[in-house]
Every structure is written in C-alpha cells, then in structure tokens.
Interface confidence: low
Amino acid sequence: EPHSESNVPAGHTIPQAHWTKLQHSLDTALRRARSAPAAAIAARVAGQTRNITVDPRLFKKRRLRSPRVLFSTQPPREAADTQDLDFEVGGAAPFNRTHRSKRSSSHPIFHRGEFSVCDSVSVWVGDKTTATDIKGKEVMVLGEVNINNSVFKQYFFETKCRDPNPVDSGCRGIDSKHWNSYCTTTHTFVKALTMDGKQAAWRFIRIDTACVCVLSRKAVRRA
C-alpha cells in the first residue's frame, strides 16, 4: 500500500505547532468518545442531512496521517505573511473564503538575490466535497466529523502554481534560447476520510502539492 506524503515542498512549511495542537484536540475528543457509552461518532457529509457512524478506531493508525491533512474545529491560521489573492488554476471562480483560509505568500523566503523558478500558492482547503482516488475514481470526501459534540472539519494543505509562465518565456531564470519551459502543478496522494457507501473509510486521494518547472530542449536549427 502506498504511503501518504510526509514532506512538504520547501518554502511551504505547514505550521507544525498549529497542526500538532489541533491534532491534539482531535485526540482528546477521540479519547472522550472512546470512553462514552456508545463510542460512536456521527459524521456529516457536507450537503447531506443523514448521520454516518464512524468507528473511532479509524483515527488510531498514525501511519495514515499526513501533515497535508488536518481535522480541525476552526480554520487553520496561515503564517502572518499572507496575500489576498483570488487565483485558481484553470480559470475557475475565485476561492470562497468562507471555506478556505487565506493562502500563504506566493514566494517562499529566499536570501537576497535568490528567486523561485516557479511561483506557487498554498492554502488550507476546507470545502472539498469530491476528489479523485488513487484508482481514478471520483469519491465523496467527508467534510465534517462530529466527535463528542465537537465538529471537526477536514482540511487539505494544497500547493499549486500561481502562473504557468512567471516570465514571458516560461519559468524564471531558464535559458530560453535553448529551453522551452513552463510551470505545472504536481500531485501526490494523501489518506483522507471519505464515504464508502454508507460508512466512512480512509482512501488515498489526489491533491495538488507542488509547482515545478517542466523543461524541453528546443529543436536545434542546422544551418
């Protein structure tokens, strides 16, 4: 079975203390839930009214956890340095900020004179309702989990390209005389809580995780 990604691209570090604190609050709620008589957790799918029962043991396996997936009672806070950018790859409608936290600065911190080949933007996505699993099947993502009367939302830390062409010729700093280049979003698979029929189940789903530069050699013109 594939492992979920644990490394976040440099320059897009997930606020670890914040993540750990929220995971700790989830663990506390789970301990309370386990000691409760029914030990049952009601999970609600966004847009659905019926309750789904989730076994608390679903959360016991720590190897399933990825720093890119977070269960939180409140929207995760980004670092203080944020940009108010309404940008989404593919020209779709701007992000709805009632569901998504502001994204981090499009530029990671560099030393003076250092630049990024591609600009990326990162955001905690909290309104994911469907996703593509590792086999290419569209699956329903659990939006919220109700544990011991605390509603935990499932957030995904996603990183994508801000622009396929940071400069006219493509990626920044590439010798455009010899190379064609463009920036593209790459993906990874993380374990997320999804609906499997009438119950919750962990599945690997695909999320945007980095922005890389794609190069191809320009055709050599012979005299």
Partner: antibody, heavy 125, light 112 residues
C-alpha cells in the same frame, strides 16, 4: 505483459442470458476498472458499463441498465459480464477493456489502454 | 448522453499522403481539473480496438509519431502525417468526461 483473455463464442436463443468472462494477467487486477464494450456487426463501439474490481463498484450505461450485470472475482482475477433477456439485436462482439486512469489524468473510468480479443455472441432462434 | 460526431465516415487516402479525421462532441469534454477526456482508437480489420491517443494529444506508448491529436472543448482532430498500408481500418473518437462513455460512429480509412 498485460493480457485480457475472454471466453469463447456463444450462441443463444432470444430471451436467454449470456455470461462472458475476462481473465486478466500482467497487472494488479484490483487497481484498474474493467469496462465492457459492445460492437454489433458492421457497427461502432458502445460502452455497456464498468466495474472497479477492488470493491465491485459498477457503473452502467442507461442503454443496458437492468439487463446487464458486471461482476468481478478477485480470487481469480476475472471480470464477468452477464446480459439477460437477449434479443437478435444483441448479436455482437463484446470486448472487455482495462481502463487505466493514469493515462487519462485520473478520469473516472476512461483509458481503455488494453483490450480483450472479443467474444462473439449470436442470438438466434 | 454526449453525442460524438465524426467526419468523414469514409476516407479514401493515398499511401504516403496525410489524412485528417474530425470529431465533434455535443458537450464540452473539459473537466473541472482542466483535463479534456477525448481519446482516439484504431481498429484494424478483424482486430480489437487499440488506443492511439489519450487526453486529446498524448500518444499512447508504441504508437508511431505519424499519429497526432489536437483540438479543445468540443472540436477535435486526428491527423496521420503520412498514411501507411497498416493504417487501414476504422478510427473512433471516444469521450470519458461524462457517463455514459460514448464513441463516435467511426471513420473508415482505406487506400485509394
């Protein structure tokens, strides 16, 4: 090498049921969808439905809904397509095809990168 | 259902000459992720179909580079730069953006 080997030709009477098998090898059976496609004599391709062998999640075309049942046996790496209430217009070659979402950017079912050799079903009274 | 319309339905070609097949869909085949799910298949006489092109313009492994795909949205084209004898057969476009999956009627390529 990826291979999809289908069962042999069948001759059926109208109203009967046919069940065709598709045994796969050369890849992990539970990883990819298996689709079934009908091709009537001298006609084009028509998608009937597909199954995810890992959990037997099946999707059907409305044109065949109610008459077709697609199943998968993980223990033998074999997919099956059963078509009931046969009529003369069901005379066709039936193909199974492996749908590799890797080739389609993780589309729901589409890819069809490997096909079985086809099974001719003749419906005649 | 998404209707896929191919033209021409019959295409007589001269060996070594280019050939072009058009495919039009009744709905956009672009999905939310930005990908366009349009494939091209070749079916030689007496054989099973074979994947040539996936996602509009990506050649499947082992497919000769004389085959190329292009287009966007609802209009797509398969081009054969120089037709060879082994290219004779029926070519189908197919869409994977919407269920049920649907194919064009097919274009029969034959040598003049």
């Amino acid at each position: 090498e990826v291979q999809l080997v289908q069962s042999g030709a069948e001759v059926k009477k109208p109203g009967a049921t046919v069940k065709i098998s598709c045994k796969v090898s050369g890849y992990s059976f539970i990883t990819y969808w298996i689709s079934w496609v009908q091709q009537a004599p001298g006609k084009g391709l028509e998608w009937m439905g597909a199954i995810d062998p890992s959990d037997s999640d099946a999707r059907y075309s409305p044109s065949f809904q109610g008459r077709v049942t697609i199943t998968a046996d993980k223990s033998t790496d074999t997919a099956y397509m059963e078509l009931s209430s046969l009529r003369s217009e069901d005379t066709a070659v039936y193909y199974c095809a492996k749908s590799d979402p890797g080739y389609s950017g993780y589309s729901l079912l589409y890819g069809f990168d490997s096909w079985g050799q086809g099974t001719l079903v003749t419906v005649s009274s | 259902d998404v209707v896929m319309t191919q033209s021409p339905l019959s295409l007589p070609v001269t060996l070594g000459q280019p050939a072009s097949i058009s495919c039009r869909s009744s709905q956009s085949l672009v999905q939310r992720n930005g990908n366009t799910y349009l494939s091209w298949f070749q079916q030689r006489p007496g054989q099973s179909p074979r994947l040539l092109i996936y996602q509009v313009s990506n050649r499947y492994s082992g497919v000769p580079d004389r085959f190329s795909g292009s287009g966007s949205g609802t209009d797509f084209t398969l081009k054969i730069s120089r037709v060879e004898a082994e290219d004779v057969g029926v070519y189908y476009c197919g869409q994977g953006a919407h269920l049920p999956l649907t194919f064009g009627q097919g274009t029969k390529v034959e040598i003049k």
